[in-house]
Interface confidence: low
């Protein structure tokens, strides 16, 4: 199939983190199973976002197990390269910019910034350190970039990309992944699920920071880590709000210019890292 080799230089409306998995089993941990054979197999590691080798015992296990590296890549990667994706244009304003400041329920009293929709500017507030909402930025700069209008009435994204008012050309200033997609929740939400050392099989949930969802896992009853919740709700409450996900909803922005209004489609430029 010649389509297998087609190039994808532009993809519109791509979702930036969390990673969009092709199949749920790609998110499963490598499972060697209870048998004792030593068989070289491959699994997709959601933390490194690569297919990796593991030793399979020969029975049971799960679907995240492939006989070859190629098969693993085909099933679990969106294409045969890792992508660093940068947005070249951003939507008018993310919905969370319109949320009221929310200090949360903790008592950390950290200086943060929020976009005040009344004054149409970013302002400082005291954040308690947990919960709250996504209208919460570590720096004034970040808040301004995401929620305020640019100096000429249009948005500037976190790469400093601007729409040139003269010729509509896109001018990316930087290629770093924006802090917009950093995790602002508790650090343990970023740790992998850990079964622990005992022999129980308790239904628990952990926050999968790569796919941005709470997923079930079996807890052994002791040990493990703090990314371990008795309910999905508890997991989401603790971890989900810390991940600022996608900015683009409809994939269209309006540029505020004196002449006619124009709609510009979001495009994503991809830089391929051939390390798989």
């Amino acid at each position: 199939d010649s389509e297998e080799d087609e190039e994808h230089t532009i993809i519109t409306d791509t979702e930036l983190p969390p990673l969009k998995l092709m199949h749920s089993f790609c998110a499963f941990k490598a499972d060697d199973g209870p048998c004792k054979a030593i068989m070289k197999r491959f699994f997709f590691n959601i933390f490194t976002r690569q297919c990796e080798e593991f030793i399979y015992g020969g029975c049971e296990g799960n679907q995240n197990r492939f006989e070859s590296l190629e098969e693993c890549k085909k099933m679990c990667t969106r294409d045969n390269a890792n992508r660093i994706i940068k947005t070249t244009l951003q939507q008018e304003k993310p919905d969370f910019c319109f949320l009221e400041e929310d200090p949360g329920i903790c008592r950390g009293y950290i200086t943060r910034y929020f976009y005040n929709n009344q004054t149409k500017q970013c302002e400082r507030f005291k954040y308690g350190g947990c919960l709250g909402n996504m209208n919460n930025f570590e720096t004034l700069e970040e808040c301004k970039n995401i929620c305020e209008d640019g100096p000429n009435g249009f948005q500037v994204d976190n790469y400093g990309t601007q729409l040139n008012a003269v010729n509509n050309s896109l001018t990316p200033q930087s290629t770093k992944v924006p802090s917009l997609f950093e995790f602002h929740g508790p650090s343990w939400c970023l740790t992998p699920a850990d079964r622990g050392l005992c022999r129980a099989n308790e239904n628990r949930f952990y926050y999968n920071s790569v796919i941005g969802k709470c997923r079930p896992f079996k807890y052994s009853g002791c040990g493990g880590n703090e990314n371990n919740f008795t309910s999905k709700q508890e997991c989401l409450r603790a971890c989900k709000k810390g991940f600022i996900q996608r900015i683009s909803k409809g994939g269209l922005i309006k540029t505020k210019r004196k002449r006619k209004k124009q709609r510009v489609k979001i495009a994503y430029e991809e830089i391929f890292v051939k390390n798989m």
Epitope: E4, H8, T14, S24, M75, T77, N80
Partner: antibody, heavy 119, light 107 residues
Framework: EVQLVESGGGLVQPGGSLRLSCAAS????????LDWVRQAPGKGLEWVAD????????LYNQKFKGRFTISRDNAKNSAYLQMNSLRAEDTAVYYC????????????WGQGTLVTVSS | DIVMTQSHKFMSTSVGDRVSITCKAS??????VAWYQQKPGQSPRLLIY???TRHTGVPDRFTGCGSGTDYTLTISSVQAEDLALYYC?????????FGGGTKLEMK
């Protein structure tokens, strides 16, 4: 509005072939996998195959692998199911469904196309 | 393959009743269960995914729950338009498999 429209069904003799088409519209085609699911008359649902439009990666129900082939044409926003060596028991309504990775479920379905295998 | 068993092929109910449709998996599917509704002559419609999350536009009288091998779809107050076939499906591993269906009908 998301729409999936199947076509290509009809009457075919045992041992014959048929190619079903699924035309997708109302969303970015490469953002979601597409699946084929079939339903024999008066029976339940049976998953057939899945394709990722970006790289063409496929998953099959082993029961159909070798006889059925799923493919896609991104330029036409379409997915296909090539069915060979058809048998009477392949008689069914064949549905195309959008597989939403975040849900791990099929969130939009076409109206289905009837395939009848009979001599 | 994982077998999804819906033990009741038919369930009789009346408008306003609370009804629970059950589904049992042949092995633990870790809440990777979806529920679909299918009316005569129509294609299936997604109601619930990940065992308990309602799909957009689905009335809140539909709720899903369960873990391990046992899953339930509950309609808290049956409406006339709810009379249909209901299928559970596991998406834990391929081949994705459906239950045989439960037909909800009027008493």
């Amino acid at each position: 509005e998301v729409q999936l429209v199947e076509s290509g069904g009809g009457l075919v003799q045992p041992g014959g072939s048929l190619r079903l088409s699924c035309a997708a519209s109302g969303y970015t085609f490469t953002d979601y996998n597409l699946d084929w699911v079939r339903q024999a008359p008066g029976k339940g649902l049976e998953w057939v195959a899945d394709i990722n439009p970006i790289n063409g990666a496929t998953l099959y129900n082993q029961k159909f692998k070798g006889r059925f082939t799923i493919s896609r044409d991104n330029a036409k926003n379409s997915a296909y199911l090539q069915m060979n060596s058809l048998r009477a028991e392949d008689t069914a309504v064949y549905y195309c469904a959008r597989y939403y990775g975040d849900y791990d479920a099929m969130d939009y379905w076409g109206q289905g196309t009837l395939v009848t295998v009979s001599s | 393959d994982i077998v999804m068993t819906q033990s009741h092929k038919f369930m009789s109910t009346s408008v306003g009743d609370r009804v629970s449709i059950t589904c049992k998996a042949s092995q633990d599917v870790h809440t990777a269960v979806a529920w679909y509704q299918q009316k005569p002559g129509q294609s299936p419609r997604l109601l619930i995914y990940w065992a308990s999350t309602r799909h957009t536009g689905v009335p809140d009288r539909f709720t899903g729950c369960g873990s391990g091998t046992d899953y339930t779809l509950t309609i808290s107050s049956v409406q006339a338009e709810d009379l249909a076939l209901y299928y559970c499906q596991q998406h834990y591993t391929t081949p994705y498999t459906f239950g045989g269906g439960t037909k909800l009908e009027m008493k």
